[in-house]
């Protein structure tokens, strides 16, 4: 494995490319910070099925980020 020093991100690996929209309870976006140098998109699944990291480069993640940013600003 390539080893390098970085902050503690919440996700391990690149994340899933897509999640069924019907399964999504909530989407949270974590922007780059001192803790983690990349954007992370965390999906909370319905019916207590836990959480999944969505690949921030995926089409679905980009749509979610856009949607959240429009809502917030």
């Amino acid at each position: 494995f390539p080893m390098f020093k970085r902050g503690r991100c919440l996700c391990i690996g690149p994340g899933v490319k897509a999640v069924k929209v019907a399964d999504i309870e909530k989407a949270s976006i974590m922007y780059p910070s001192n803790n983690c140098d990349k954007i992370e998109v965390i999906i909370t699944l319905k019916e207590n099925k836990g959480q999944r990291c969505l690949n921030p480069k995926s089409k679905q993640a980009r749509l979610i980020i856009k949607k959240v940013e429009r809502k917030n600003f």
Epitope: F1, I12, G13, G15, G50, Q51, C53
Partner: nanobody
Framework: EVQLVESGGGLVQAGGSLRLSCEAS????????IGWFRQAPGKEREGVSC????????YYADSVKGRFTISSDNAKNTVYLQMNSLKPEDTAVYYC???????????????????WGQGTQVTVSS
């Protein structure tokens, strides 16, 4: 079809070493986090080590820190678990498991993993 196949288990004396292999097929290796779990008779399955081959993250349960090392060979689609200074309490069936979109907070939860191997038995005698 996704498949994980473990090998390398066996009988070893306390203080000895073993290297387990987990060969993956049917998916893009870099997209997945692959972890090692173990289950001793009458006990729950517990996380031992976890990593992602794409970003170099490695994590260890406190019980194996400093003794076990996880590594991978992307060309061979294989993850290894090097186990040194083995103790009788390390006796268990060892499984590798793979998933996408894993969070650090849930990496020791077997329910977070989508695919599992059949397991390989490790027995450490005193």
């Amino acid at each position: 079809e996704v498949q994980l196949v473990e090998s390398g288990g066996g009988l070893v004396q306390a203080g000895g070493s073993l290297r387990l292999s987990c060969e993956a097929s049917g998916f893009t290796f870099d997209d997945y986090a692959i972890g090692w779990f173990r289950q001793a008779p009458g006990k729950e399955r517990e996380g031992v080590s976890c990593c992602s081959s794409s970003d170099g993250s490695t994590y260890y349960a406190d019980s194996v820190k400093g003794r076990f090392t996880i590594s991978s060979d992307n060309a061979k689609n294989t993850v290894y678990l090097q186990m040194n200074s083995l103790k009788p309490e390390d006796t268990a069936v060892y499984y590798c498991a793979a998933t996408q979109g894993l969070l650090i907070a849930t990496m020791w939860n077997p329910a977070s993993y989508d695919y599992w191997g059949q397991g390989t038995q490790v027995t450490v005698s005193s």
